[in-house]
C-alpha cells in the first residue's frame, strides 16, 4: 500500500510540478504534509533555475548530476539521492519522510556513517587485544610488533627475536647480549662500540671533560690529576680538584725594617755605593740574626776592587777577611753567634786597625798599616755588597766560603750614613723583608724546590745502592712531596709525600715507585707544634721504615716489581729533590704539590744543607722556619 | 786639595753675551755631574743647569732654556756656560758646584741619591744698561 | 717643575737651642732631599744628603728627618758658628729646585 502511495504522489508531482509548474501551495497538495513541502520546494526552485531557458548560474551547478528538468525534480524527494552517508563507511541507505537512515558497516559509526571506530582505544578491549602495538585502519584494525620481536599465528602476540643467535657475528669482537626487542654490542668498561668497524675501542673520557683540570685518558680508562704546582688536590670524587689547605697556620708577618739577606740562592741582595768625603773611614754597624752557621754577611771593595773587606760568618762565628796593597789577613774570633737572637755586630777602621765588636764588647782588632780604601778625586768611594760576592772572588779570597746566607739585619748603619735612602726603597719589595719571629730549621714555603746531587752508590755494600733517609718534618699544609728521586728520563722512580687522610685532621705518608704507592703510613696528626720524625732504609731488595707506624703495603709480589723498577733508575743518574718535582710529567706520581712546612733532610748520615744545594727556589728559607700562628685574643 | 774656581764674570748690557768658566782640581771631571747655581743680591739659590759626565746630557731651568748653554771639556778639566741674550734678572753670584752621587743603591733598580758637595766661591754677573 | 717651600722664612734662637726648620715638596720626592748651610759671602756647604744622612765632617748635631713631602733639619743644639742661612732642595728630578731659604739668627 506504501509504495501505491508513493507511486500516486509521483504521478501527481509530474503531472502538478514538472508537465506545469506549481508554487508551494500546489507542491503541499501533492506531499499532504509540510515536512516534506518544506524540504521540496527550495530545491525544486533550484531545479527550475538550472534548467530554464538553458541559464547556467552558480545555483546549477548543484544540479549537474541531472541530464533534464525532470530527473532534477523527481529526485528530490529520494532522501537517499544523491548519497548522504559515507561511502566507505555506509551498507545502506533507506528514505524516509525528508530524512534518511544510514545503516553503517562494522567498524564504523556516526548518522552517515562518516566515522571510523578505534578499536585499539576500545576499553572493553584494551589496545585491541593486541600485546604490542595497535594499528587502527578505516572501518577495522591490526595488530603489529616492535622492532625485535615476530607476530604469533594468533595475530595479536608477539615474540623476542635472539638476534645473537641467528647472526653469531652480529657484533664482531664485541659481546653480543640479546636484550628484548634488541641486541646490544658490549664492550669492557672505558670502551665504545664502533658500527662500522664493529669492535671496541677506547673512550677518550678527557675529550668530554670529565675532569675538573688535568686529565690522562689510557686503554679503557682515565686519571685525573690536579695541578698540585698551583696549590691544588684532587677531591673525593676523583674528578674535581680543591685547595691545598693550611692545616697548621705560620706567623708569615714581615717587617721592613729587617733586610733579609737570603733573597736571592745565588746573589747579592743589596748593592751600596758610598762617595764620601776622603776624611771618611769603612764603619758597618748592624744587628744580625741567623740559625746559618756559613755566609757573606757584607763584602765591601774599592772602586778597582784592588783592596776588599769581608764580613762573614763561619762556624756560627764572625770571621773578618781584608786585602789591600799593604796587607792580606783573616780572622775569626768571638761567640757563636747563629743562636737565632739579635747580636749587634760593628766593623769600624781606626786608624791602625780594624775593631770587630759583638754587643759593643771588642771581640777582634786586625792591625792594619795604611787606610783601607785608597780615596780618589777628594772622595772616599766604596762598594758595599750584601749577602753575597759582586762576582767570582773566590780566588782572590784568603779562605774560601759558601756565600749563602739565611740571616736577617736590622739597624745598619753603614759609612756612618745611617739606613737613609736605602729603607725606603725596602719597604717597597716585599720579598726582601724578614720575618719577624723564626725558628731554627729550613722552610719550604709551597713554591718550589731544592736539587741535590748525591752518589747513593756504595761501593763496600754488597747491595750496592742504598738510600738511608730520616725526616724531621712540621707541615704547615697537608699534601705535598717532601723528598723526590727524578732520573734524566724524567720519571719519578722514589717519592716520599704527604696527603691529607681520609679521616679528619690527619694525613697520610705515602712513598712511590713511579706513580704506584709502594708503601702509607696512615692516618698520622702531622700538622701539630711538634716536629714528626720519619726514618727508612731503601735498597734494591726491600725497604724498611725504622719509625714504628700502622703501614698499609702493597703485595710482596708487587713489592718487589716495584723496587726492581727503583733499582734499574738507581743504576742511572738520579737527581734528589727537596719540597717537592721539577717539570715532569704531572702523572709522574700520586702527588705533585709542592711540599709546605718546616722540614730537616738527612740522607745516609748526612744532614743536607739548603746552602750547599745546586739550585734552590729563592723563596726556601735554608736555616729559618716561621714559627706556628699564635691566636691572640684579637686575631 | 778638592775644588773649583770660577771666572768669567763681569758687567755686560741687556742682549749681551758673557761665558763663564769653572776650572777644577783635586779630581777628574769626568766621574761628575756638574751644575751651575746663582744667587741674586739678597736672594736665595736658583739651580741653573746641569750636565752629565761625559756631556750626553744637559738640563736648564726654564727662564734660561734657549739663551744659556752648559758645556764641558773633561781633557781641561773646566765647565762652561755660554749666556747670550742677558736680561737684568739674570743678574746674580753664579756657583759651580759638583753634583756627586754620594750614595747608590741597587735593589731590583738603581737609585742614586745626589748632592752638590764641592761649590767655588762664584763669580759676579752684572747685567745694566 | 717641583716646587720647595721652607718655613719659617727666619727664626731667632739661643745658643743651645733647639731649633727645626721644615721643608715641604709639591709632590713626592721619596728621600731625594738634600740641606745646605750658607754664611753671609761664602758658597753653600752641604749638610745632608738623602733626607737623613750626614756628609763626613758635619758635625752630628745636625739631622734630617722625613720622606715623601715632608722634610726636618733639626739642630740638636745650636753652637754660634750654626747662625746661617739653611737651604732644602730636592734631587729627585730636573730641573733641581731649592726652597726659598730660613735663616738663623742670634736671638
Known amino acids: 500500500a506504501n509504495s501505491m502511495l508513493e507511486e500516486t504522489k509521483q504521478g501527481n508531482l509530474e503531472r502538478e510540478c514538472i508537465e506545469e509548474l506549481c508554487n508551494k501551495e500546489e507542491a503541499r497538495e501533492v506531499f499532504e504534509n509540510d515536512p516534506e513541502t518544506d524540504y521540496f520546494y527550495p530545491k525544486y526552485l533550484v531545479c527550475l533555475r538550472s534548467f530554464q531557458s538553458g541559464l547556467f548560474t552558480a545555483a546549477r551547478q548543484s544540479t549537474d548530476a541531472y541530464p533534464d528538468l525532470r530527473s532534477c525534480v523527481n529526485a528530490i524527494p529520494d532522501q537517499c539521492s544523491p548519497l548522504p552517508c559515507n561511502e566507505d563507511g555506509y551498507m545502506s541507505c533507506k528514505d524516509g519522510k525528508a530524512s534518511f537512515t544510514c545503516t553503517c558497516k562494522p567498524g564504523w559509526q556516526g548518522e552517515k556513517c562518516e566515522f571510523d571506530i578505534n578499536e585499539c582505544k576500545d576499553p572493553s578491549n584494551i589496545n585491541g587485544g593486541c600485546s604490542q602495538i595497535c594499528d587502527n585502519t578505516p572501518g577495522s584494525y591490526h595488530c603489529s610488533c616492535k622492532s625485535g620481536f615476530v607476530m604469533l599465528s594468533n595475530k595479536k602476540d608477539c615474540k623476542d627475536v635472539d638476534e645473537c643467535s641467528l647472526k653469531p657475528n652480529m657484533c664482531g669482537t664485541a659481546v653480543c647480549k640479546n636484550i628484548p626487542g634488541d641486541f646490544e654490542c658490549e664492550c669492557p668498561e672505558g670502551y665504545r662500540y664502533n658500527l662500522k668497524s664493529k669492535s671496541c675501542e677506547d673512550v677518550d673520557e678527557c675529550s668530554e671533560n670529565m675532569c675538573a683540570q688535568l686529565c690522562v685518558n689510557y686503554p679503557g680508562g682515565y686519571t685525573c690529576y690536579c695541578d698540585g704546582k698551583k696549590g691544588f688536590k684532587l677531591a673525593q670524587d676523583q674528578k674535581s680538584c680543591e685547595a691545598v689547605s693550611v692545616c697548621l697556620p705560620l706567623n708569615l708577618d714581615t717587617k721592613y725594617e729587617l733586610l733579609y739577606l737570603a733573597e736571592q740562592f745565588a746573589g747579592v741582595v743589596l748593592y751600596l755605593k758610598f762617595r764620601l768625603p776622603e776624611i771618611s773611614r769603612f764603619s758597618a754597624e748592624f744587628d744580625f740574626r741567623t740559625y746559618d752557621s756559613q755566609g757573606v754577611i757584607l763584602y765591601a771593595e774599592s772602586i778597582d776592587h784592588s783592596a776588599w773587606l769581608l764580613i762573614a760568618l763561619r762556624g756560627g762565628k764572625i770571621e773578618v777577611q781584608l786585602k789591600n796593597e799593604h796587607t792580606s789577613k783573616i780572622t775569626t774570633g768571638g761567640d757563636i753567634i747563629n743562636n737565632g737572637l739579635w747580636n749587634m755586630v760593628s766593623v769600624e777602621e781606626l786608624e791602625h786597625s780594624i775593631s770587630i765588636k759583638i754587643a759593643k764588647e771588642a771581640v777582634m782588632d786586625i792591625n792594619k798599616p795604611g787606610p783601607l780604601f785608597k780615596p780618589e778625586n777628594g772622595l772616599l768611594e766604596t762598594k758595599v755588597y750584601f749577602a753575597g760576592f759582586p762576582r767570582k772572588v773566590e780566588s782572590e779570597l784568603i779562605k774560601p766560603i759558601n756565600p749563602r746566607l739565611d740571616g736577617c739585619i736590622r739597624s745598619w748603619n753603614l759609612m756612618k750614613q745611617g739606613a737613609s735612602g736605602i729603607k725606603e726603597i725596602i719597604q717597597e719589595k716585599q720579598n726582601k723583608h724578614c720575618l719577624v719571629t723564626v725558628e731554627k730549621g729550613s722552610y719550604y714555603p709551597g713554591s718550589g724546590i731544592a736539587e741535590f746531587h748525591i752518589d747513593y752508590n756504595n761501593g763496600s755494600n754488597a747491595e750496592g745502592w742504598h738510600i738511608n733517609v730520616t725526616l724531621n718534618i712540621r707541615p704547615s699544609m697537608g699534601t705535598g712531596v717532601m723528598l723526590a728521586l727524578v732520573s734524566s728520563n724524567n720519571t719519578v722512580p722514589f717519592a716520599v709525600s704527604l696527603v691529607d687522610s681520609t679521616s679528619e685532621k690527619s694525613q697520610d705518608i705515602v712513598i712511590s715507585v713511579e706513580n704506584t704507592v709502594i708503601y702509607r703510613i696512615q692516618a698520622l696528626s702531622l700538622c701539630s707544634n711538634q716536629r714528626s720524625h720519619l726514618e727508612f732504609r731503601v735498597n734494591r731488595n726491600n725497604l724498611e721504615l725504622l719509625t714504628p707506624l700502622k703501614i698499609e703495603t702493597i703485595s710482596q709480589e708487587e713489592l718487589q716489581t716495584q723496587l726492581a723498577i727503583l733499582d734499574k733508575a738507581m743504576k742511572g743518574k738520579v737527581a734528589t729533590y727537596l719540597g717537592g718535582l721539577p717539570d715532569v710529567p704531572f702523572s709522574a706520581t700520586p702527588v705533585n704539590a709542592f711540599y709546605n712546612g718546616c722540614m730537616e733532610v738527612n740522607i745516609n748520615g748526612v744532614e743536607l744543607d739548603l746552602d750547599e744545594a745546586i739550585s734552590k727556589h729563592n723563596d726556601i728559607r735554608a736555616h729559618s722556619c716561621p714559627s706556628v700562628w699564635k691566636k691572640t685574643k684579637n686575631s | 786639595e778638592v775644588q773649583v774656581v770660577e771666572s768669567g764674570g763681569g758687567l755686560v748690557q741687556p742682549g749681551g753675551s758673557l761665558r763663564l768658566s769653572c776650572a777644577a782640581s783635586?779630581?777628574?771631571?769626568?766621574?761628575?755631574?756638574m751644575s751651575w747655581v746663582r744667587q741674586a743680591p739678597g736672594k736665595g739659590l736658583e739651580w741653573v743647569a746641569n750636565?752629565?759626565?761625559?756631556?750626553?746630557?744637559?738640563y736648564y731651568v726654564d727662564s734660561v732654556k734657549g739663551r744659556f748653554t752648559i758645556s764641558r771639556d773633561n781633557a781641561k778639566n773646566s765647565l762652561y756656560l755660554q749666556m747670550n741674550g742677558l736680561r737684568a734678572e739674570d743678574t746674580a753670584l753664579y756657583y759651580c758646584?759638583?753634583?756627586?752621587?754620594?750614595?747608590?743603591?741597587?735593589?731590583?733598580?738603581?737609585?742614586?741619591?745626589?748632592?752638590?758637595?764641592?761649590w767655588g766661591q762664584g763669580t759676579t754677573v752684572t747685567v745694566s744698561a | 717643575d717641583i716646587q720647595m717651600t721652607q718655613s719659617p722664612s727666619s727664626l731667632s734662637a739661643s745658643v743651645r737651642d733647639r731649633v727645626t726648620i721644615n721643608c715641604r715638596a709639591s709632590q713626592s720626592i721619596r728621600s731625594y732631599l738634600n740641606w745646605y748651610q750658607q754664611k753671609p759671602g761664602k758658597a753653600p756647604k752641604l749638610l745632608i744628603y738623602a733626607a737623613s744622612s750626614l756628609q763626613g765632617g758635619v758635625p752630628s748635631r745636625f739631622s734630617g728627618s722625613g720622606s715623601g713631602t715632608d722634610f726636618t733639619l733639626t739642630i740638636s743644639s745650636l753652637q754660634p758658628e750654626d747662625f746661617a742661612t739653611y737651604y732644602c732642595?730636592?734631587?729627585?728630578?730636573?730641573?733641581?729646585?731649592f726652597g726659598q731659604g730660613t735663616k738663623v739668627e742670634i736671638k
Open positions: 783635586g779630581f777628574t771631571l769626568n766621574s761628575f755631574w
Open positions: 750636565i752629565k759626565e761625559d756631556g750626553s746630557e744637559k
Open positions: 732642595q730636592q734631587s729627585y728630578s730636573t730641573p733641581r729646585t
Open positions: 758646584a759638583r753634583e756627586t752621587d754620594i750614595l747608590t743603591a741597587y735593589y731590583s733598580d738603581y737609585y742614586s741619591y745626589y748632592g752638590m758637595d764641592v
